[in-house]
């Protein structure tokens, strides 16, 4: 009996036309939502004038439906048993699941000022930038709508720069009508233990953002894993959002709509400094902000963001070192709300429920030449927003799963 079940599972999790896995893989049957909480800065003037701690108050959730578009350019390669695809991006605002509208205003760090002052280091350029920041009446902080902040706006200061710089900025700009990939993943036809594992991303086996093993593209995209998952496994996956591969470890057994699943979580060790976790040495890319690689819980992804000083962390700086959160008041990290988990049905390897949580931060540094940053006496890794992307198998699909998979085994 068990052998027959194994044979059926192996057949049905292959990523090719006609299998259960393929149908759900091309277009997810699960509704996926991305909730945003924006960190509204309460004391912009005191920070700019006196280098005070930044007082933030989170506002949210603002919810979007995401990942509703089918994979595009799905192409099987029979020679190397892979399937390649693009994952299109799309976001639809859900007013009924949000505390306000996309037109709500927030006081946030001026993205353009922080990024430009960091990237454009030439003395004369900094003088030009300073005069244009003043001319455009820009400052260290700005008021922006949710829509502008997330999806992009034309920046008044960058628009005055007499060079062909990018004048539209936004945390997720550009997003709609773009796609992630090309991904090329193993379809499992020749070897089911490789199904959904990424072979190449954007035509390469490495990212070119990190040194050594940190640069590798490991595992799947976390939507599914090879079947017959064991609790002892370390599940590797790649997340383009954070420009790196990461891993999850077993935490507990969970019953999801009558389906026994394994809850895998991202452990604090994955965010540790190289002092505590030597494997993380290659995620430390500079010595100053990281205090000689002793800070932890924030990841400098500037190399993946055209040099813009973007730092990824867990929400509210969960699992981060005290020096990171010290200049920020109003954060309350807790594991239950702010960690990432995957609920995996172990027989098929399908992720039936997940919560991906991350925070987007921007580095801002004192600058002698730029007036609005002149009074700063320290570097700040400024939280802009955090997000919670969730998906849960629907009741109908859960019934089907129970009757066709778990029911047959029990």
């Amino acid at each position: 009996g068990d052998l027959l079940i194994q044979k059926t599972i192996k057949k049905q999790v292959v990523l090719e036309e006609g299998t259960i896995a393929f149908k759900n893989w091309v277009k997810t049957g699960t509704e996926v939502y991305r909730q945003f909480w924006i960190f509204d800065v309460q004391n912009p003037q005191e920070v700019m004038m006196n280098s005070s701690n930044i007082q933030v108050k989170q506002r949210g959730p603002y919810t979007y439906r995401v990942r509703f578009l089918a994979k595009e350019n799905v192409t099987q390669d029979a020679e190397d048993n892979t399937v390649s695809f693009l994952q299109p991006n799309g976001a639809i605002f859900e007013p009924s699941l949000s505390v306000g509208t996309e037109a709500d205003n927030f006081t946030v760090l001026n993205l353009a000022v922080a990024a430009a002052s960091h990237i454009y280091q030439n003395q004369f350029v900094q003088m030009i930038l300073n005069s244009l920041i003043n001319k455009s009446k820009s400052s260290m902080f700005q008021v922006r709508t949710l829509r502008e902040l997330l999806w992009g706006y034309r920046d008044p200061f960058l628009s005055l720069v007499p060079y062909p710089v990018t004048t539209t900025v936004g945390l997720f700009y550009p997003y709609n009508n773009t796609a992630d990939g090309v991904y090329k993943v193993f379809n499992g036809k020749d070897n089911i233990s490789k199904v959904a594992i990424i072979d190449t991303y954007k035509g390469k086996r490495n990212l070119s953002y990190w040194e050594s093993h940190c640069d590798m593209i490991n595992g799947t995209d976390a939507a599914s894993f090879p079947p017959f998952v064991e609790k002892s496994q370390v599940l590797q996956f790649f997340s383009s959002d954070i420009c790196r591969s990461i891993y999850a470890v077993f935490e507990s057994d969970v019953n999801l709509k009558g389906i026994p699943v394994y809850r895998f979580v991202l452990p604090s060790k994955a965010f540790a400094s190289p002092v505590e976790n030597p494997d993380n040495y290659c995620f430390c890319t500079e010595k100053i902000i990281s205090k000689n690689c002793t800070s932890y819980g924030v990841l400098d992804i500037s190399k993946c963001k055209e040099g813009r000083p973007v730092y990824i962390s867990l929400p509210h700086f969960l699992y981060a070192s005290p020096d990171v959160s010290e200049p920020i008041d109003g954060l309350n990290p807790n594991e239950e709300e702010h960690r990432t988990y995957l609920d995996i049905e172990p027989i098929t390897g399908f992720t039936l429920q997940f919560a991906k949580r991350l925070q987007v931060n921007l580095l801002v540094k004192p600058s002698e030449k730029i007036q609005v940053l002149k009074n700063l006496k320290r570097n700040y890794i400024v939280p802009i927003l955090w997000l919670n992307e969730t998906g849960t198998i629907g009741d109908e699909k859960a019934n089907m799963f129970r009757s066709q998979v778990t029911g047959k085994i029990n």
């Epitope: 990024a115 990237i119 454009y120 280091q121 030439n122 004369f124 350029v125 030009i128 720069v161 007499p162 060079y163 062909p164 710089v165 990018t166 055209e306 040099g307 813009r308």
Partner: nanobody, 120 residues
Framework: QVQLQESGGGLVQPGGSLRLSCAAS????????MSWYRQTPGKERELVAA????????YYADSVKGRFTISRDDAKNTVYLQMNSLKPEDTAVYYC?????????????WGQGTQVTVSS
Amino acid sequence: QVQLQESGGGLVQPGGSLRLSCAASGFTFSNYAMSWYRQTPGKERELVAAMQSTGGTTYYADSVKGRFTISRDDAKNTVYLQMNSLKPEDTAVYYCNAVTLQGWSEYDYWGQGTQVTVSS
């Protein structure tokens, strides 16, 4: 490849004049802001004069205002620094710099420098 070659430095008496030239190649000269910096031993490089582009913003350090003039000839891919009423404190290595911005990148190039010595 990008090259910036300074010339025109030398020994001059206080009150004298010199004209520095910087010949550029390997990039679209007219798209770049051109600057002159100077450095004395143990000190940081100091911005002396800069010019955004022909007809664009020019900048002079307070210490050289009224004495130094920056100019450029886009047809010859050359930037000049006319230095009049030279003082002993103008003694330094003078460097030519070319910079432009594109997207989120800064392209910043330097010459090897030319020595200017003001002494009697």
